[in-house]
Protein backbone atom coordinates (compact mmCIF):
# COMPACT_ATOMS: atom_id res chain seq x y z
CA UNK A 1 0.00 0.00 0.00
CA UNK A 2 1.45 3.40 -0.98
CA UNK A 3 2.09 5.69 2.03
CA UNK A 4 0.03 9.25 1.83
CA UNK A 5 1.96 12.61 2.40
CA UNK A 6 1.81 13.98 5.60
CA UNK A 7 -0.96 16.59 5.99
CA UNK A 8 -1.88 20.40 6.83
CA UNK A 9 1.88 21.31 8.62
CA UNK A 10 2.04 24.13 11.09
CA UNK A 11 5.28 25.97 11.61
CA UNK A 12 5.49 27.55 15.17
CA UNK A 13 8.33 30.09 16.13
CA UNK A 14 7.94 31.39 19.78
CA UNK A 15 11.19 33.49 20.69
CA UNK A 16 14.64 30.58 19.71
CA UNK A 17 12.12 28.09 19.75
CA UNK A 18 10.83 26.39 16.37
CA UNK A 19 8.31 23.83 16.81
CA UNK A 20 6.29 21.39 13.69
CA UNK A 21 3.63 20.17 13.53
CA UNK A 22 1.63 17.71 11.41
CA UNK A 23 -1.26 15.45 10.97
CA UNK A 24 -0.69 12.15 10.10
CA UNK A 25 -2.76 11.21 6.72
CA UNK A 26 -3.60 7.73 7.67
CA UNK A 27 -4.34 6.74 10.93
CA UNK A 28 -4.47 3.39 10.45
CA UNK A 29 -0.96 2.30 9.21
CA UNK A 30 0.95 1.69 12.49
CA UNK A 31 5.12 2.33 12.70
CA UNK A 32 5.78 5.24 10.54
CA UNK A 33 8.27 7.63 11.02
CA UNK A 34 8.60 11.36 9.18
CA UNK A 35 11.06 13.37 8.13
CA UNK A 36 11.85 16.62 7.14
CA UNK A 37 14.27 18.60 4.67
CA UNK A 38 14.77 22.14 4.57
CA UNK A 39 16.36 24.53 1.68
CA UNK A 40 17.33 27.71 2.10
CA UNK A 41 16.50 30.14 -0.52
CA UNK A 42 18.82 30.28 -3.63
CA UNK A 43 19.85 26.57 -2.97
CA UNK A 44 18.55 24.07 -5.17
CA UNK A 45 19.46 20.95 -2.97
CA UNK A 46 17.50 19.84 0.20
CA UNK A 47 19.38 19.26 3.39
CA UNK A 48 17.82 16.90 6.47
CA UNK A 49 16.62 18.65 8.82
CA UNK A 50 18.56 17.85 12.07
CA UNK A 51 16.20 16.82 15.29
CA UNK A 52 13.35 15.79 13.03
CA UNK A 53 14.30 12.54 11.31
CA UNK A 54 12.90 9.41 11.62
CA UNK A 55 10.22 11.27 14.29
CA UNK A 56 7.39 8.62 15.30
CA UNK A 57 5.56 11.66 16.54
CA UNK A 58 3.67 14.29 15.10
CA UNK A 59 5.85 17.23 16.28
CA UNK A 60 9.13 17.76 16.34
CA UNK A 61 11.56 20.34 17.55
CA UNK A 62 14.77 21.84 14.59
CA UNK A 63 15.62 25.06 17.59
CA UNK A 64 18.92 23.24 17.07
CA UNK A 65 19.86 24.34 13.24
CA UNK A 66 21.36 27.86 13.65
CA UNK A 67 19.07 29.77 10.81
CA UNK A 68 19.20 33.02 9.41
CA UNK A 69 16.39 34.37 11.23
CA UNK A 70 15.55 36.68 8.19
CA UNK A 71 16.30 34.35 5.40
CA UNK A 72 13.51 32.45 3.36
CA UNK A 73 13.58 28.69 4.06
CA UNK A 74 11.53 25.47 2.58
CA UNK A 75 10.23 22.87 4.43
CA UNK A 76 8.90 19.18 3.48
CA UNK A 77 7.78 16.42 4.99
CA UNK A 78 7.71 12.85 3.91
CA UNK A 79 6.47 9.52 5.64
CA UNK A 80 8.35 6.59 5.97
CA UNK A 81 7.87 2.76 6.64
CA UNK A 82 9.08 0.15 4.42
CA UNK A 83 8.81 2.57 1.66
CA UNK A 84 8.64 6.40 1.52
CA UNK A 85 5.53 8.35 0.76
CA UNK A 86 5.80 11.58 -2.03
CA UNK A 87 7.23 14.66 0.02
CA UNK A 88 5.06 17.30 0.75
CA UNK A 89 6.25 20.64 0.55
CA UNK A 90 5.07 23.43 3.10
CA UNK A 91 4.98 26.97 1.82
CA UNK A 92 8.26 29.19 2.41
CA UNK A 93 8.68 31.17 5.19
CA UNK A 94 10.70 33.88 7.08
CA UNK A 95 11.60 33.15 10.63
CA UNK A 96 11.83 36.05 11.89
CA UNK A 97 8.06 37.31 10.24
CA UNK A 98 6.67 34.33 11.41
CA UNK A 99 8.18 34.21 14.90
CA UNK A 100 6.38 35.32 18.02
CA UNK A 101 7.36 36.70 21.26
CA UNK A 102 7.34 34.28 23.92
CA UNK A 103 6.32 35.10 27.74
CA UNK A 104 8.20 37.29 29.53
CA UNK A 105 10.04 36.55 32.63
CA UNK A 106 8.58 38.51 35.80
CA UNK A 107 9.97 39.43 39.23
CA UNK A 108 8.23 40.96 41.56
CA UNK A 109 9.39 43.27 44.56
CA UNK A 110 6.76 44.59 47.38
CA UNK A 111 6.81 47.37 49.49
CA UNK A 112 4.57 48.67 51.82
CA UNK A 113 2.27 50.99 48.83
CA UNK A 114 4.26 50.09 45.77
CA UNK A 115 5.28 47.16 43.48
CA UNK A 116 8.64 46.51 41.34
CA UNK A 117 8.24 44.93 38.48
CA UNK A 118 11.27 43.60 36.66
CA UNK A 119 10.80 42.53 33.31
CA UNK A 120 13.17 40.39 31.30
CA UNK A 121 12.37 38.37 27.60
CA UNK A 122 11.98 35.15 27.60
CA UNK A 123 14.47 33.81 26.20
CA UNK A 124 18.13 34.81 27.55
CA UNK A 125 20.45 36.24 24.62
CA UNK A 126 18.15 35.23 22.46
CA UNK A 127 18.98 34.64 18.54
CA UNK A 128 15.60 35.93 16.69
CA UNK A 129 15.31 39.45 18.93
CA UNK A 130 18.75 39.78 19.27
CA UNK A 131 18.80 43.18 16.75
CA UNK A 132 15.53 44.37 18.63
CA UNK A 133 16.54 43.72 22.36
CA UNK A 134 16.36 47.70 23.39
CA UNK A 135 13.07 47.65 21.35
CA UNK A 136 10.85 45.49 23.72
CA UNK A 137 7.93 47.37 25.72
CA UNK A 138 6.07 45.70 27.48
CA UNK A 139 2.04 45.77 28.98
CA UNK A 140 0.80 44.31 31.84
CA UNK A 141 -2.47 43.78 33.00
CA UNK A 142 -2.99 43.94 37.64
CA UNK A 143 -5.60 43.25 39.42
CA UNK A 144 -6.55 42.76 43.41
CA UNK A 145 -6.32 39.21 44.10
CA UNK A 146 -10.29 40.12 45.79
CA UNK A 147 -11.73 41.72 43.49
CA UNK A 148 -10.58 40.88 39.92
CA UNK A 149 -11.45 44.46 38.76
CA UNK A 150 -8.06 44.76 36.14
CA UNK A 151 -5.99 47.29 35.07
CA UNK A 152 -4.07 47.52 31.66
CA UNK A 153 -0.76 49.62 31.92
CA UNK A 154 0.85 50.13 28.30
CA UNK A 155 4.01 50.62 26.92
CA UNK A 156 6.47 49.81 29.94
CA UNK A 157 9.79 48.81 30.10
CA UNK A 158 12.00 46.57 32.12
CA UNK A 159 11.76 48.30 35.29
CA UNK A 160 8.30 49.75 36.38
CA UNK A 161 7.08 50.77 39.75
CA UNK A 162 3.86 50.77 40.29
CA UNK A 163 2.54 53.53 43.53
CA UNK A 164 -0.55 54.14 45.15
CA UNK A 165 -1.30 50.23 46.32
CA UNK A 166 -2.98 49.01 49.49
CA UNK A 167 -0.86 47.62 52.37
CA UNK A 168 -1.12 43.98 53.31
CA UNK A 169 -2.91 43.24 49.86
CA UNK A 170 -2.36 40.32 47.32
CA UNK A 171 -1.82 42.14 43.72
CA UNK A 172 -1.73 39.58 40.61
CA UNK A 173 -0.55 40.53 37.42
CA UNK A 174 0.88 39.51 34.27
CA UNK A 175 3.07 40.77 31.36
CA UNK A 176 3.61 40.55 27.52
CA UNK A 177 5.89 42.10 25.17
CA UNK A 178 5.65 43.96 22.13
CA UNK A 179 8.14 44.95 19.42
CA UNK A 180 6.19 48.05 17.79
CA UNK A 181 9.40 48.52 15.24
CA UNK A 182 7.33 44.68 13.56
CA UNK A 183 4.10 44.94 14.60
CA UNK A 184 4.74 42.34 17.08
CA UNK A 185 2.93 41.43 19.91
CA UNK A 186 3.53 38.51 22.45
CA UNK A 187 2.23 36.16 24.67
CA UNK A 188 1.35 36.85 28.72
CA UNK A 189 3.28 35.40 30.98
CA UNK A 190 1.90 33.46 33.62
CA UNK A 191 -0.07 35.40 36.53
CA UNK A 192 2.47 36.22 39.49
CA UNK A 193 0.69 37.34 42.81
CA UNK A 194 2.82 39.26 45.11
CA UNK A 195 1.33 41.09 48.80
CA UNK A 196 2.26 44.09 49.63
CA UNK A 197 4.46 44.94 52.87
CA UNK A 198 2.34 46.46 56.21
CA UNK A 199 2.51 50.21 56.03
CA UNK A 200 5.64 51.42 56.96
CA UNK A 201 6.26 53.24 59.74
CA UNK A 202 7.85 56.78 57.63
CA UNK A 203 5.75 57.49 54.23
CA UNK A 204 7.73 58.19 51.67
CA UNK A 205 8.33 62.00 50.26
CA UNK A 206 5.64 63.45 47.54
CA UNK A 207 5.09 65.86 45.27
CA UNK A 208 8.71 66.32 43.98
CA UNK A 209 9.44 69.09 41.84
CA UNK A 210 12.26 70.62 40.25
CA UNK A 211 12.82 74.40 39.32
CA UNK A 212 15.32 76.50 37.80
CA UNK A 213 16.98 79.15 39.35
CA UNK A 214 19.86 80.85 37.99
CA UNK A 215 22.59 78.23 37.51
CA UNK A 216 20.93 75.88 40.19
CA UNK A 217 17.83 73.30 40.16
CA UNK A 218 16.04 73.29 43.01
CA UNK A 219 14.23 70.17 44.21
CA UNK A 220 11.16 70.41 46.61
CA UNK A 221 9.30 68.02 48.07
CA UNK A 222 6.50 67.34 50.37
CA UNK A 223 6.66 65.24 53.86
CA UNK A 224 4.31 64.44 56.99
CA UNK A 225 6.79 65.03 59.86
CA UNK A 226 9.38 67.53 61.07
CA UNK A 227 12.95 66.13 62.03
CA UNK A 228 13.60 64.25 58.91
CA UNK A 229 16.84 64.40 56.49
CA UNK A 230 16.79 63.43 53.30
CA UNK A 231 18.45 61.93 50.48
CA UNK A 232 18.00 62.72 46.88
CA UNK A 233 19.24 59.66 43.90
CA UNK A 234 19.41 59.76 40.34
CA UNK A 235 19.24 57.64 37.27
CA UNK A 236 19.38 57.90 33.58
CA UNK A 237 15.70 57.10 32.14
CA UNK A 238 17.38 54.38 29.23
CA UNK A 239 18.51 52.19 31.78
CA UNK A 240 15.51 51.23 32.87
CA UNK A 241 14.91 49.79 28.98
CA UNK A 242 17.76 47.47 29.03
CA UNK A 243 17.33 44.09 28.93
CA UNK A 244 18.10 41.49 31.48
CA UNK A 245 19.96 44.20 33.45
CA UNK A 246 18.26 44.40 36.88
CA UNK A 247 20.90 46.36 38.48
CA UNK A 248 20.00 49.55 38.68
CA UNK A 249 22.91 52.12 39.61
CA UNK A 250 21.38 54.87 41.28
CA UNK A 251 23.47 57.87 42.63
CA UNK A 252 23.53 60.41 45.16
CA UNK A 253 23.21 64.21 44.31
CA UNK A 254 26.31 65.43 46.87
CA UNK A 255 24.51 68.42 48.03
CA UNK A 256 21.09 66.17 48.49
CA UNK A 257 22.86 63.80 50.66
CA UNK A 258 21.41 63.92 54.43
CA UNK A 259 19.52 67.51 53.55
CA UNK A 260 17.62 68.41 56.74
CA UNK A 261 15.20 70.70 54.60
CA UNK A 262 12.01 69.30 52.00
CA UNK A 263 14.41 70.95 49.20
CA UNK A 264 17.80 70.65 48.09
CA UNK A 265 19.74 73.48 45.61
CA UNK A 266 22.44 71.91 43.05
CA UNK A 267 23.91 73.10 40.01
CA UNK A 268 22.75 72.45 36.44
CA UNK A 269 26.28 71.46 35.73
CA UNK A 270 25.45 68.28 37.69
CA UNK A 271 23.57 66.62 35.00
CA UNK A 272 24.47 66.61 31.46
CA UNK A 273 21.73 66.89 28.65
CA UNK A 274 19.44 64.38 29.16
CA UNK A 275 16.37 62.23 30.93
CA UNK A 276 17.04 61.34 34.10
CA UNK A 277 14.80 59.58 36.83
CA UNK A 278 15.50 61.70 40.37
CA UNK A 279 14.01 59.87 44.14
CA UNK A 280 14.07 61.21 47.35
CA UNK A 281 14.29 59.02 50.39
CA UNK A 282 13.49 60.26 54.30
CA UNK A 283 14.65 59.15 57.61
CA UNK A 284 14.62 60.16 61.01
CA UNK A 285 17.74 58.14 62.32
CA UNK A 286 15.87 55.28 62.97
CA UNK A 287 13.41 54.25 60.55
CA UNK A 288 13.55 54.95 56.57
CA UNK A 289 10.81 55.39 54.28
CA UNK A 290 10.53 53.75 51.41
CA UNK A 291 11.60 55.61 48.12
CA UNK A 292 9.63 58.04 46.54
CA UNK A 293 7.23 57.81 43.51
CA UNK A 294 10.45 58.34 40.59
CA UNK A 295 9.81 61.56 38.76
CA UNK A 296 11.18 62.15 34.95
CA UNK A 297 13.43 65.11 34.66
CA UNK A 298 14.48 66.07 31.32
CA UNK A 299 16.94 68.90 31.82
CA UNK A 300 16.03 69.97 27.86
CA UNK A 301 12.89 70.97 28.75
CA UNK A 302 13.71 71.33 32.35
CA UNK A 303 15.78 74.66 31.67
CA UNK A 304 12.75 76.28 29.26
CA UNK A 305 9.94 75.28 31.40
CA UNK A 306 9.50 78.26 33.82
CA UNK A 307 6.15 78.98 35.64
CA UNK A 308 4.13 81.79 33.31
CA UNK A 309 4.06 84.90 34.20
CA UNK A 310 0.71 86.82 34.18
CA UNK A 311 -1.52 90.18 34.55
CA UNK A 312 -5.08 89.75 36.78
CA UNK A 313 -7.73 92.52 35.15
CA UNK A 314 -10.45 92.52 38.35
CA UNK A 315 -14.38 92.67 37.42
CA UNK A 316 -16.96 92.17 39.93
CA UNK A 317 -17.72 88.52 39.39
CA UNK A 318 -14.69 87.61 37.40
CA UNK A 319 -10.73 87.79 36.81
CA UNK A 320 -9.69 88.34 33.22
CA UNK A 321 -6.09 86.70 33.29
CA UNK A 322 -3.28 87.30 30.29
CA UNK A 323 -0.48 85.17 30.02
CA UNK A 324 2.82 85.88 29.06
CA UNK A 325 6.18 84.47 29.11
CA UNK A 326 7.75 83.80 31.31
CA UNK A 327 11.40 85.81 32.03
CA UNK A 328 14.81 84.53 33.05
CA UNK A 329 17.32 85.98 35.44
CA UNK A 330 18.02 89.71 33.71
CA UNK A 331 14.10 90.58 32.71
CA UNK A 332 14.28 88.71 29.21
CA UNK A 333 11.26 86.88 28.22
CA UNK A 334 11.72 83.12 27.42
CA UNK A 335 10.80 81.97 24.01
CA UNK A 336 8.70 78.57 24.07
CA UNK A 337 8.28 76.89 20.94
CA UNK A 338 6.55 74.38 21.59
CA UNK A 339 2.89 73.98 22.58
CA UNK A 340 1.87 74.84 26.59
CA UNK A 341 -1.38 74.27 28.24
CA UNK A 342 -1.92 76.32 31.34
CA UNK A 343 -3.19 75.25 34.56
CA UNK A 344 -4.94 77.99 36.82
CA UNK A 345 -5.92 77.34 40.41
CA UNK A 346 -7.79 79.73 42.18
CA UNK A 347 -9.50 80.07 45.70
CA UNK A 348 -10.93 82.67 48.23
CA UNK A 349 -7.98 84.09 50.52
CA UNK A 350 -9.99 83.23 53.29
CA UNK A 351 -11.08 79.31 52.23
CA UNK A 352 -8.64 76.18 51.11
CA UNK A 353 -11.32 75.33 48.63
CA UNK A 354 -8.81 75.41 45.24
CA UNK A 355 -10.84 75.37 41.74
CA UNK A 356 -9.11 74.90 38.76
CA UNK A 357 -9.28 75.80 34.96
CA UNK A 358 -7.21 74.30 32.39
CA UNK A 359 -6.69 76.00 29.27
CA UNK A 360 -4.87 76.40 26.19
CA UNK A 361 -5.20 79.72 25.42
CA UNK A 362 -3.34 82.90 26.85
CA UNK A 363 -6.16 85.48 28.08
CA UNK A 364 -8.81 83.11 30.26
CA UNK A 365 -11.67 84.21 32.10
CA UNK A 366 -11.99 82.97 35.82
CA UNK A 367 -16.12 83.18 36.04
CA UNK A 368 -18.35 82.93 39.15
CA UNK A 369 -16.70 85.26 41.53
CA UNK A 370 -18.49 87.10 44.45
CA UNK A 371 -17.81 90.83 44.23
CA UNK A 372 -15.64 92.61 46.82
CA UNK A 373 -13.81 89.69 47.44
CA UNK A 374 -9.91 88.52 47.73
CA UNK A 375 -9.23 85.91 45.64
CA UNK A 376 -5.32 84.65 44.75
CA UNK A 377 -4.18 82.47 41.67
CA UNK A 378 -1.31 80.81 40.92
CA UNK A 379 -0.73 79.56 37.72
CA UNK A 380 1.62 76.43 36.06
CA UNK A 381 2.27 75.48 32.37
CA UNK A 382 2.33 72.17 31.35
CA UNK A 383 3.57 70.90 27.62
CA UNK A 384 0.95 69.02 25.40
CA UNK A 385 3.36 66.63 23.78
CA UNK A 386 2.62 63.13 25.48
CA UNK A 387 5.80 61.98 24.97
CA UNK A 388 7.70 64.89 26.85
CA UNK A 389 4.91 65.42 29.53
CA UNK A 390 6.78 68.09 31.61
CA UNK A 391 5.39 70.68 34.06
CA UNK A 392 6.55 73.80 34.99
CA UNK A 393 6.50 74.57 38.85
CA UNK A 394 3.48 76.87 39.34
CA UNK A 395 4.03 80.68 40.11
CA UNK A 396 4.30 82.61 43.01
CA UNK A 397 -0.42 83.28 44.37
CA UNK A 398 -1.20 86.75 43.07
CA UNK A 399 -4.09 87.63 45.12
CA UNK A 400 -6.70 90.47 44.07
CA UNK A 401 -10.03 91.96 45.30
CA UNK A 402 -13.05 91.88 42.53
CA UNK A 403 -14.59 94.84 42.36
CA UNK A 404 -18.03 96.13 43.72
CA UNK A 405 -21.23 94.82 41.90
CA UNK A 406 -22.54 96.21 38.12
CA UNK A 407 -19.25 96.22 36.88
CA UNK A 408 -19.04 93.26 35.15
CA UNK A 409 -18.84 94.92 31.32
CA UNK B 1 32.84 31.20 33.90
CA UNK B 2 32.18 34.33 36.71
CA UNK B 3 35.33 33.86 39.14
CA UNK B 4 37.03 35.98 41.80
CA UNK B 5 40.03 35.47 42.99
CA UNK B 6 41.75 37.01 46.27
CA UNK B 7 45.18 37.71 47.46
CA UNK B 8 46.66 35.43 49.45
CA UNK B 9 46.60 35.31 53.63
CA UNK B 10 48.43 38.33 55.88
CA UNK B 11 49.70 38.90 58.92
CA UNK B 12 49.25 42.80 60.32
CA UNK B 13 50.95 44.66 63.48
CA UNK B 14 48.10 46.41 65.59
CA UNK B 15 48.05 49.88 64.25
CA UNK B 16 49.43 48.75 60.37
CA UNK B 17 47.14 48.68 57.52
CA UNK B 18 45.71 45.53 55.20
CA UNK B 19 45.05 45.81 51.36
CA UNK B 20 43.55 42.70 50.32
CA UNK B 21 42.77 42.59 46.29
CA UNK B 22 39.94 40.69 44.19
CA UNK B 23 40.31 39.84 40.47
CA UNK B 24 37.07 39.49 38.38
CA UNK B 25 37.03 37.29 35.32
CA UNK B 26 34.04 36.35 33.09
CA UNK B 27 32.53 39.45 33.91
CA UNK B 28 33.12 43.24 33.22
CA UNK B 29 33.50 44.47 36.64
CA UNK B 30 32.37 47.78 35.53
CA UNK B 31 28.44 46.57 34.95
CA UNK B 32 27.99 45.43 38.49
CA UNK B 33 28.92 46.49 42.39
CA UNK B 34 31.74 44.99 44.24
CA UNK B 35 31.08 44.29 48.00
CA UNK B 36 33.27 43.53 50.63
CA UNK B 37 31.98 41.54 53.98
CA UNK B 38 34.22 39.98 56.75
CA UNK B 39 33.50 37.28 58.83
CA UNK B 40 35.66 36.91 62.52
CA UNK B 41 36.72 33.61 63.70
CA UNK B 42 33.31 31.74 64.65
CA UNK B 43 31.46 34.43 64.03
CA UNK B 44 28.71 35.97 61.29
CA UNK B 45 28.93 37.98 57.89
CA UNK B 46 29.34 41.94 58.31
CA UNK B 47 29.08 44.04 55.54
CA UNK B 48 32.05 46.58 55.28
CA UNK B 49 30.88 48.74 51.89
CA UNK B 50 30.77 48.61 48.35
CA UNK B 51 32.19 50.53 45.47
CA UNK B 52 31.06 51.01 41.91
CA UNK B 53 33.97 50.29 39.58
CA UNK B 54 32.21 52.16 36.76
CA UNK B 55 32.99 55.33 38.95
CA UNK B 56 34.69 54.12 41.95
CA UNK B 57 31.68 55.78 43.72
CA UNK B 58 31.53 53.86 47.52
CA UNK B 59 29.56 53.42 50.39
CA UNK B 60 30.81 52.00 53.55
CA UNK B 61 29.09 51.03 56.71
CA UNK B 62 29.43 53.59 59.36
CA UNK B 63 31.38 51.39 61.38
CA UNK B 64 34.23 51.30 58.83
CA UNK B 65 33.81 54.57 57.79
CA UNK B 66 36.94 56.76 58.08
CA UNK B 67 39.12 53.38 58.48
CA UNK B 68 38.14 52.04 55.05
CA UNK B 69 39.19 52.73 51.54
CA UNK B 70 38.24 50.63 48.25
CA UNK B 71 39.27 51.34 44.73
CA UNK B 72 38.98 49.67 41.67
CA UNK B 73 40.93 49.57 38.58
CA UNK B 74 39.16 48.38 35.76
CA UNK B 75 42.07 47.80 33.41
CA UNK B 76 42.68 44.47 35.15
CA UNK B 77 39.42 43.70 36.70
CA UNK B 78 40.69 44.65 40.22
CA UNK B 79 39.19 45.74 43.24
CA UNK B 80 40.94 46.75 46.72
CA UNK B 81 39.84 46.89 50.07
CA UNK B 82 42.27 48.27 52.14
CA UNK B 83 41.78 48.55 56.09
CA UNK B 84 44.03 51.19 58.32
CA UNK B 85 44.53 51.48 62.29
CA UNK B 86 44.17 48.10 62.69
CA UNK B 87 43.16 45.84 65.74
CA UNK B 88 43.17 42.67 67.09
CA UNK B 89 39.39 42.45 66.45
CA UNK B 90 40.12 43.40 62.75
CA UNK B 91 41.49 39.53 62.69
CA UNK B 92 38.60 37.64 60.21
CA UNK B 93 38.41 36.58 56.62
CA UNK B 94 37.45 38.76 54.47
CA UNK B 95 35.89 38.19 51.53
CA UNK B 96 34.84 40.13 48.00
CA UNK B 97 31.28 39.41 46.73
CA UNK B 98 29.91 40.66 42.96
CA UNK B 99 26.60 42.77 43.48
CA UNK B 100 24.01 41.52 40.71
CA UNK B 101 21.00 41.88 39.41
CA UNK B 102 18.34 42.59 42.25
CA UNK B 103 21.21 43.88 44.30
CA UNK B 104 21.99 40.51 45.50
CA UNK B 105 25.75 38.85 46.47
CA UNK B 106 25.95 36.39 43.75
CA UNK B 107 29.29 35.45 43.68
CA UNK B 108 32.05 35.36 46.02
CA UNK B 109 36.10 35.15 46.58
CA UNK B 110 37.71 32.52 47.81
CA UNK B 111 38.69 34.89 51.29
CA UNK B 112 41.54 36.53 52.23
CA UNK B 113 42.10 35.44 56.22
CA UNK B 114 43.47 39.10 58.08
CA UNK B 115 45.50 38.28 61.28
CA UNK B 116 46.40 41.21 63.69
CA UNK B 117 48.99 40.38 65.79
CA UNK B 118 51.74 41.86 67.71
CA UNK C 1 21.30 50.08 60.88
CA UNK C 2 18.33 47.81 60.39
CA UNK C 3 18.92 44.40 62.94
CA UNK C 4 18.12 41.17 61.46
CA UNK C 5 17.63 38.35 64.06
CA UNK C 6 17.66 35.00 63.52
CA UNK C 7 16.04 32.45 64.95
CA UNK C 8 16.92 29.61 66.24
CA UNK C 9 21.07 30.09 66.35
CA UNK C 10 21.68 26.30 66.96
CA UNK C 11 19.27 23.35 65.28
CA UNK C 12 20.05 19.69 65.77
CA UNK C 13 17.82 18.22 63.25
CA UNK C 14 17.72 14.93 61.19
CA UNK C 15 17.78 14.11 57.45
CA UNK C 16 14.52 14.06 56.26
CA UNK C 17 13.35 16.42 58.69
CA UNK C 18 11.62 19.61 57.43
CA UNK C 19 13.58 22.84 58.75
CA UNK C 20 11.92 26.12 59.44
CA UNK C 21 14.17 29.24 60.06
CA UNK C 22 13.07 33.04 60.64
CA UNK C 23 14.64 36.43 60.20
CA UNK C 24 13.32 39.74 61.82
CA UNK C 25 13.87 42.67 60.85
CA UNK C 26 13.61 45.74 63.30
CA UNK C 27 12.18 47.90 60.78
CA UNK C 28 10.09 47.34 57.12
CA UNK C 29 12.69 45.95 54.16
CA UNK C 30 9.87 45.10 51.85
CA UNK C 31 11.04 41.84 50.22
CA UNK C 32 14.38 42.72 49.59
CA UNK C 33 15.78 39.73 51.81
CA UNK C 34 18.58 37.13 50.68
CA UNK C 35 19.80 33.69 52.19
CA UNK C 36 22.67 32.23 52.06
CA UNK C 37 24.24 28.68 52.92
CA UNK C 38 27.58 28.79 54.25
CA UNK C 39 29.71 25.49 54.90
CA UNK C 40 33.06 25.16 57.16
CA UNK C 41 35.70 27.01 55.62
CA UNK C 42 33.77 27.64 52.30
CA UNK C 43 32.27 31.24 50.94
CA UNK C 44 28.51 31.94 51.14
CA UNK C 45 26.80 30.84 48.63
CA UNK C 46 23.14 32.54 47.58
CA UNK C 47 20.16 30.34 47.83
CA UNK C 48 16.81 32.69 48.28
CA UNK C 49 16.76 36.57 46.90
CA UNK C 50 14.15 39.19 47.36
CA UNK C 51 12.35 36.66 49.73
CA UNK C 52 11.06 33.87 48.09
CA UNK C 53 13.00 33.51 44.29
CA UNK C 54 15.09 30.57 44.25
CA UNK C 55 18.37 30.97 42.57
CA UNK C 56 18.98 28.43 39.55
CA UNK C 57 20.65 25.21 40.48
CA UNK C 58 19.69 25.25 44.06
CA UNK C 59 17.15 22.32 44.87
CA UNK C 60 13.67 22.82 45.60
CA UNK C 61 13.58 21.72 48.97
CA UNK C 62 14.58 25.14 49.59
CA UNK C 63 11.83 28.11 49.54
CA UNK C 64 11.48 31.39 51.38
CA UNK C 65 8.86 33.75 52.32
CA UNK C 66 7.76 36.52 54.21
CA UNK C 67 7.63 40.65 53.72
CA UNK C 68 8.38 43.50 55.50
CA UNK C 69 9.75 41.88 58.66
CA UNK C 70 9.24 38.67 59.27
CA UNK C 71 10.94 36.08 56.64
CA UNK C 72 11.37 32.56 56.54
CA UNK C 73 13.56 30.21 54.80
CA UNK C 74 12.38 26.32 54.82
CA UNK C 75 13.80 23.31 54.07
CA UNK C 76 11.09 20.38 53.35
CA UNK C 77 13.57 17.44 53.63
CA UNK C 78 16.73 17.82 54.66
CA UNK C 79 19.60 16.46 53.38
CA UNK C 80 23.24 15.55 54.00
CA UNK C 81 24.50 18.30 52.16
CA UNK C 82 22.39 20.28 53.88
CA UNK C 83 23.92 21.00 57.35
CA UNK C 84 25.67 24.04 57.43
CA UNK C 85 25.12 27.72 58.83
CA UNK C 86 22.18 29.95 57.06
CA UNK C 87 22.04 33.60 56.43
CA UNK C 88 20.05 36.23 56.15
CA UNK C 89 20.72 39.59 54.83
CA UNK C 90 18.43 42.87 54.04
CA UNK C 91 19.38 44.86 50.65
CA UNK C 92 16.77 47.70 51.45
CA UNK C 93 19.10 50.15 52.93
CA UNK C 94 22.60 50.58 53.61
CA UNK C 95 24.53 49.34 55.32
CA UNK C 96 23.38 46.22 54.08
CA UNK C 97 23.32 43.90 57.45
CA UNK C 98 23.16 40.39 58.17
CA UNK C 99 21.10 38.23 60.49
CA UNK C 100 23.30 36.48 63.33
CA UNK C 101 22.89 33.21 61.52
CA UNK C 102 21.72 29.36 62.41
CA UNK C 103 24.18 26.92 62.53
CA UNK C 104 21.92 23.23 61.58
CA UNK C 105 24.12 20.25 63.37
CA UNK C 106 23.00 16.27 62.71
CA UNK C 107 20.94 15.13 65.72
Known amino acids: KNLKSPQKVEVDIIDDNFILRWNRSDESVGNVTFSFDYQKTGMDNWIKLSGCQNITSTKCNFSSLKLNVYEEIKLRIRAEKENTSSWYEVDSFTPFRKAQIGPPEVHLEAEDKAIVIHISPGTKDSVMWALDGLSFTYSLVIWKNSSGVEERIENIYSRHKIYKLSPETTYCLKVKAALLTSWKIGVYSPVHCIKTTVENELPPPENIEVSVQNQNYVLKWDYTYANMTFQVQWLHAFLKRNPGNHLYKWKQIPDCENVKTTQCVFPQNVFQKGIYLLRVQASDGNNTSFWSEEIKFDTEIQAFLLPPVFNIRSLSDSFHIYIGAPKQSGNTPVIQDYPLIYEIIFWENTSNAERKIIEKKTDVTVPNLKPLTVYCVKARAHTMDEKLNKSSVFSDAVCEKTKPGNTSK | QVQLVQSGAEVVKPGASVKVSCKGS????????MHWVRQAPGQGLEWIGR????????KYAPKFQGRVTMTADTSTSTVYMELSSLRSEDTAVYYC???????????WGQGTLVTVSS | DIQLTQSPSFLSTSVGDRVTITCKAS??????VVWYQQKPGKSPKVLIY???YRVSGVPSRFSGSGSGTEFTLIISSLQPEDFATYYC?????????FGQGTKLEIK
Open chain 2, 97 to 107: ARGGNFYVMDY
Open chain 2, 26 to 33: GFNIKDYY
Open chain 2, 51 to 58: IDPEDAET
Open chain 3, 27 to 32: QNVGTN
Open chain 3, 50 to 52: SAS
Open chain 3, 89 to 97: QQKNNYPYT
